[in-house]
Interface confidence: low
């Protein structure tokens, strides 16, 4: 890379007197201090008198004694105004100024684009004292320039509260094009137009863009950055990138994949999480979404019984949370279950079908022909019934539940009794005389308690009073309140 000065690069004399303009001398500076903080104050200990500063970039020192003459204006010497170089190269530039020895506490600082450069920049200030003036050279070096080093650099010197500013030195770091906007991966509908954008900057400018699709150039003629490529539509996945060219060479963007939206893959791993008599909770793992978000899913349920009519029940649900409770199913039945999900393009195929079963249900019919009669001699109520016509899906009968409610003079007491499945009769102790006893019976399976029969009432006449506690404990002398006949 060439460091190029846009101005004529004559060596300017840095200062008058014994110092040659090129500084290629064997003069050793009296004081050479590296900048720890970006600038180094020049400390001068010669006798001084304050001068009257002028405003602006030039200070004209004045001496107060009668015999003294005004000193020449203070200003930074001209130097190269524009340095062009390639990225990662080194550069060194400087400011120089001659300061009368009457001044002390002079400080030089470096500024870039209006901000003071502090910290880790490599700046050195050198002092070359003479009888009347001290030449100060502030040099700034960058070992490996980057784009961020582009900008306008100036020196500032404070002298007796006056600020002297150098002419700017423009550093232009040139390199390969740098992308500020690269194409983005997209999921698009088949045969639908879409746009890709690519933008790159120098220096050097201009930057020209070529588009590449699947390793082949799309445009024969380059477009000036920024460039928007309108793709009329794709039928299959493609990879796009853009090439950015300038005088330094070529940079290629990342390749981005443009996917074609398609119907999703079928869900996998449909599994049964829980079964009850009338519902099944399923979960599934969604398949590949076809580059388009899932919208919802359809659960298809058909009876696995070969004698069924083959109708399919369909339940629609949102795509998340991959969980659905299928309701309104028959008890103790076998079902085939499949899941299909959709995106904006369409429905997936149905998942592999899985077999699931509901558990036993509670009986659907109450016991029949319930009769109740009073056995006064033993102070018992006898109950008879007929076994209900149970359906297969109601499960196996495990027993009966008897509810008997005793009502008398504002008192009401309900007792529940459980009896085994083999009986069709039961005997309960009279709880209250001069009262009405209301009896209802329900069949019980492992699936639960079925409906109660219609109530049957019997009046228990006054025949002494049987006391009772508010629990279901039987009256004295009746250790077992229910007897299976």
């Amino acid at each position: 890379a060439i460091t190029e000065a846009r101005e004529e690069a004559k060596p300017y004399p840095l200062f008058p007197g014994p110092f040659p303009g090129s500084l290629q001398t064997d003069h050793t500076p009296l004081l050479s201090l590296p900048h720890a903080s970006g600038y180094q104050p020049a400390l001068m200990f010669s006798p001084t008198q304050p001068g009257r500063p002028h405003t602006g970039n030039v200070a004209i020192p004045q001496v107060t004694s009668v015999e003294s003459k005004p000193l020449p204006p203070l200003a930074f010497k001209h130097t190269v105004g524009h340095i062009i170089l390639s990225e990662h190269k080194g550069v060194k530039f400087n400011c120089s100024i001659s300061v009368p020895n009457i001044y002390q506490d002079t400080t030089i600082s470096w500024w870039k684009d209006g901000k003071e450069l502090l910290g880790a920049h490599h700046a050195i200030t050198q002092f070359y004292p003479d009888d009347e003036v001290t030449a100060i050279i502030a040099s700034f070096s960058i070992t490996s320039v980057q784009r961020s080093d582009n900008g306008s650099y100036i020196c500032k010197m404070k002298i007796n509260n006056e600020e002297i500013v150098s002419d700017p030195i423009y550093i232009e770091v040139q390199g390969l094009p740098h992308f500020t906007k690269q194409p983005e991966s997209m999921n698009v509908t088949r045969n639908t137009a879409f746009n890709l954008t690519c933008q790159a900057v120098g220096p050097p400018e201009p930057v020209n863009i070529f588009w590449v699709q699947n390793s082949s150039r799309v445009n024969e003629q380059p477009e000036k950055s920024p460039s928007v490529l309108t793709v009329p539509g794709l039928t299959e996945m493609a990879v796009f990138s853009c090439e950015a060219h300038n005088d330094k060479g070529l940079t290629v963007s990342k390749g981005v994949q443009i996917n074609i939206k398609a119907i999703p893959s079928p869900p996998t791993e449909v599994s049964i999480r829980n079964s009850t008599a009338h519902s099944i909770l399923i979960s599934w793992v969604p398949g590949f979404d076809g580059y388009s978000p899932f919208r919802n899913c359809s659960i298809q349920v058909k009876e696995a019984d070969p004698l069924s009519n083959g109708s399919v029940m369909i339940f629609n649900t949102s795509a998340l949370p991959h969980l659905y409770q299928i309701k309104q199913l028959q008890a103790l039945a076998n079902y085939s279950i499949g899941v299909s999900c959709m995106n904006e393009i369409g429905w997936s195929a149905v998942s592999p079908w899985i077999l699931a079963s509901t558990t036993e249900g509670a009986p659907s019919v109450a016991p029949l022909n319930v009769t109740v009669f009073l056995n006064e001699s033993s102070d018992n109520v006898d109950i008879r019934w007929m076994k209900p016509p149970t359906k297969q899906q109601d499960g196996e009968l495990v027993g009966y539940r008897i509810s008997h409610v005793w009502q008398s003079a504002g008192i009401s007491k309900e007792l529940l009794e459980e009896v085994g499945q083999n009986g069709s009769r039961a005997r309960i102790s009279v709880q209250v005389h001069n009262a009405t006893c209301t009896v209802r019976i329900a069949a019980v399976t492992r699936g639960g308690v079925g409906p109660f029969s219609d109530p049957v009432k019997i009046f228990i006449p006054a025949h002494g009073w049987v006391d009772y506690a508010p629990s279901s404990t039987p009256a004295p002398g009746n250790a077992d309140p229910v007897l299976i006949i």
């Epitope: 919802n296 369909i314 904006e344």
Partner: antibody, heavy 120, light 108 residues
């Protein structure tokens, strides 16, 4: 039973907008799409787009993009279709229809239709 | 977009006759995505057949549907006076959802 009841007929001037409503009942409103289909006098059926009430997801026919907006109010189970910048060729009967996802995509229930006349 | 072309546009038939309406698609459509509607004068369209051959609820058994690929057919066996209507095919395979131009059936 499932019912879709639409708002009454409208007469509009060119350049104006119209907003048609469709009140659903008899099913869970958020479970099915509401589609809008129009039929110009003596012409066939033309699908305008759908909205999924659960999340407000819309899909419009490209022909109407930029002019049509479909919205829903789930608290009242009502869908709305607004068509802007009306022209005389927008004169049509506008139907709402429930979209059924048993393999995309058919319309199992229809509203009674709303006649929109665009005339200066 | 998928274009559906119905044939014929218009047909005048006598009661008890058998009627066949065809619908041709511009690209192949799975039978799951193909449906038929009936629209009587001054009424909304009504779903007639879904997924090529399934009768919608309440549709008489004299209606039937068949087809695959790009060609689909609606058949009415033993036409009745109440079948005077315009019949539309529809595809649900891709957006925009599209209908055929319609076939008007007149009873002589």
């Amino acid at each position: 039973q499932v019912q879709l009841v639409q708002s009454g007929a409208e007469v509009k001037k060119p350049g104006a907008s119209v907003k048609v409503s469709c009140k659903a009942s008899g099913y869970t409103f958020t479970t099915y799409d509401i589609n809008w289909v129009r039929q110009a006098p003596g012409q066939g059926l033309e699908w305008m787009g759908w909205i999924y009430p659960r999340d407000g997801y819309t899909k419009y026919n490209e022909k109407f993009k930029g002019r049509v907006t479909m919205t829903t109010d789930t608290s009242t189970s009502t869908a709305y279709m607004e068509l802007r910048s009306l022209r005389s060729d927008d004169t049509a009967v506008y139907y709402c229809a429930r979209g059924y996802y048993d393999n995309l995509y058919y319309f199992d229930y229809w509203g009674q239709g709303t006649t929109v006349t665009v005339s200066s | 977009e998928i274009v559906l072309t119905q044939s014929p546009d218009f047909q005048s038939v006598t009661p008890k006759e058998k009627v066949t309406i065809t619908c041709s698609a511009s690209s192949i459509i799975s039978s799951n995505y193909f449906h038929w509607y009936q629209q009587k004068p001054d009424q909304s369209p009504k779903l007639l057949i879904y997924r090529t051959s399934n009768l919608a609820s309440g549709v008489p058994s004299r209606f039937s549907g068949s087809g695959s690929g790009t060609d689909y057919t609606l058949t009415i066996n033993s036409l009745e006076a109440e079948d005077a209507a315009t019949y539309y095919c529809q595809q649900g395979r891709s957006v925009p959802l599209t209908f055929g131009q319609g076939t008007k059936l007149e009873i002589k």
